[in-house]
């Protein structure tokens, strides 16, 4: 987690700040959801354990043309140490069921809130 702030940032963003911003973005998505998120697109669910950020990105990056999650995709890339491209699934990412993006975001949000409360920022 080096420089999540981008070029305009005065320095590296603390992990706690980065996680809080990701949580805020997911909250924003769930609260502003009127029509079905990403037209009801379905993505692979993930195990919310080790490698979660990369797995989440690997799943969501396959959804294109959905502006509502573009910022989330960018933010997740800052948490993942390797480059992720569409169609790429690591050995950690077991593909066993697909769920709607809206449910994926809700599940991820609940887990990230738990991590934040417990002080697990990396």
């Amino acid at each position: 987690l080096t420089c999540l702030g981008g070029f305009a940032s005065p320095g590296p963003v603390p992990p706690s700040t980065a996680l809080r911003e990701l949580i805020e973005e997911l909250v924003n998505i769930t609260q502003n959801q009127k029509a079905p998120l990403c037209n009801g697109s379905m993505v692979w669910s993930i195990n919310l354990t080790a490698g979660m950020y990369c797995a989440a990105l690997e799943s969501l990056i396959n959804v294109s043309g959905c502006s509502a999650i573009e910022k989330t995709q960018r933010m997740l890339s800052g948490f993942c140490p390797h480059k992720v491209s569409a169609g790429q699934f690591s050995s950690l990412h077991v593909r066993d069921t697909k769920i709607e993006v809206a449910q994926f975001v809700k599940d991820l949000l609940l887990h990230l809130k738990k991590l934040f409360r417990e002080g697990q920022f990396n």
Epitope: P36, N39, G40, S41, M42, N62
Partner: nanobody
Framework: EVQLLESGGGLVQPGGSLRLSCAAS????????MDWVRQAPGKGREWVST????????WYADSVKGRFTISRDNSKNTLYLQMNGLRAEDTAVYYC?????????WGQGTLVTVSS
């Protein structure tokens, strides 16, 4: 323009079989992962199965594993779902979908009713 046209649904008795087809056009079919998704009356959308672009890899929801088989014929731009051992809880409208695109590209679906 992406078009998906499902067919093959109907009324079948419990334990019976049906084969659904989906004719695809408007995109490079053999490059796309494809899904079958269903929606039971008054319920939300449920993922059923996915097949890789080549057809070599397949995935199934636990509820249909061992009973349903997804396949594709890339030379005919067609996706299939062979449904055996049908149960009342399989009653739904079945849609084929270009993976990750949502229902903006779904067809009209095909109704499967399992009843004695």
């Amino acid at each position: 323009e992406v078009q998906l046209l499902e067919s093959g649904g109907g009324l079948v008795q419990p334990g019976g079989s049906l084969r659904l087809s989906c004719a695809a056009s408007g995109f490079t079919f053999d490059r796309e992962e494809m899904d079958w998704v269903r929606q039971a009356p008054g319920k939300g959308r449920e993922w059923v199965s996915t097949i890789s672009p080549s057809g070599r890899k397949t995935w199934y929801a636990d509820s249909v594993k061992g009973r349903f088989t997804i396949s594709r014929d890339n030379s005919k731009n067609t996706l299939y779902l062979q449904m055996n051992g049908l149960r009342a809880e399989d009653t739904a409208v079945y849609y084929c979908a270009k993976a990750y695109t949502g229902f903006r590209y779904w067809g009209q679906g095909t109704l499967v009713t399992v009843s004695s």
